[in-house]
Amino acid sequence: DPVKPSRGPLVTCTCESPHCKGPTCRGAWCTVVLVREEGRHPQEHRGCGNLHRELCRGRPTEFVNHYCCDSHLCNHNVSLVLEATQPPSEQPGTDGQ
């Protein structure tokens, strides 16, 4: 089950966000999260994932894109993009179910 969290071998990842305690972190997988809040430029955060692997499978929206990978520093050079703005009649779906 790919959704089931695993606490097996940890991987070292690049950590770049306001909450990083150093340049790298250790986790079950590596993450890149690109977020655009209303009226602000998109921000890209790199770090480690240990819970809720389902976020890795969510489709990109105009507000958020999640990326996950499983090898040493695999999130270091990844750049994400957001989906193009949707017509007003469409609802951005962040719920990946």
């Epitope: 089931k4 606490r7 306001p18 999260v33 955060h45 480690c48 240990n50 819970l51 809720h52 990946g96």
Partner: antibody, heavy 118, light 108 residues
């Protein structure tokens, strides 16, 4: 010390929308280590997970409630919110917000009773 | 969807006795993300055990957790008066997050 506090109306009319807010203090809602959950408990019953939101705004909901639930986050206010539409008496419950980490649901609000009645 | 079944529904014991509470999953779950909570009337649940066997901050060492696969156990080695409450097991860290129906621990 991290604290969570639920707020919102204690009485909602049937068919209306229940709206609650959870204010987080003593820690940042924007930390990537945490997931922000809503849970409810019907009178005298067990705990039911409603859904969670990540700081990015990504959400996942209990399939049994998904069609009626919206969870949102306001990182600038360190708050996240629950909306439950088309409520009935069966939605009368104590509603809790809680922080989830690798160490489980480690911090909870004190809970707020919401009664659905006309 | 994984179902957690707790047994017994009610456990009647005296202070000083040993309590053994069971939580059974309908399919194998990650032991890294199995938690136990204590709830007293009018209060929010309180985290006791996470990752099957790690005690949360401030939890006395009379509380211990064990298990793997589908069978998990919360043990209270010597019951104190304040331990009489309802106990819930939970799977977290993946969706859907699931709670057991609870075990009520009452004074005999």
């Amino acid at each position: 010390q991290v604290q969570l506090q639920e707020s919102g109306p204690g009485l909602v009319k049937p068919s209306q929308t229940l709206s609650l807010t959870c204010t987080v203090s003593g820690g940042s809602i924007s930390s990537g280590e945490y997931y922000w959950n809503w849970i409810r408990q019907h009178p005298g019953k067990g705990l039911e997970w409603i859904g969670y939101i990540y700081y990015s705004g990504s959400t996942y909901y209990n399939p049994s409630l998904k069609s009626r639930v919206t969870i949102s986050v306001d990182t600038s206010k360190n708050q996240f919110s629950l909306k439950l539409s088309s409520v009935t008496a069966a939605d009368t419950a104590v509603y809790y917000c809680a922080r989830e980490s690798v160490a489980g649901f480690d911090y909870w609000g004190q809970g707020t009773l919401v009664t659905v009645s006309s | 969807e994984i179902v957690l079944t707790q047994s017994p529904g009610t456990l009647s014991l005296s202070p000083g006795e040993r309590a053994t509470l069971s939580c059974r999953a309908s399919q194998s779950v990650s032991s890294s993300y199995l938690a136990w909570y204590q709830q007293k009337p009018g209060q929010a649940p309180r985290l006791l055990i996470y990752g099957t066997s790690s005690r949360a901050t401030g939890i006395p060492d009379r509380f211990s957790g064990s298990g793997s696969g589908t069978d998990f156990t919360l043990t209270i080695s010597r019951l104190e008066p304040e331990d009489f409450a309802v106990y819930y097991c939970q799977i977290y860290g993946s969706i859907p997050i699931t709670f057991g129906q609870g075990t009520r621990l009452e004074i005999k």
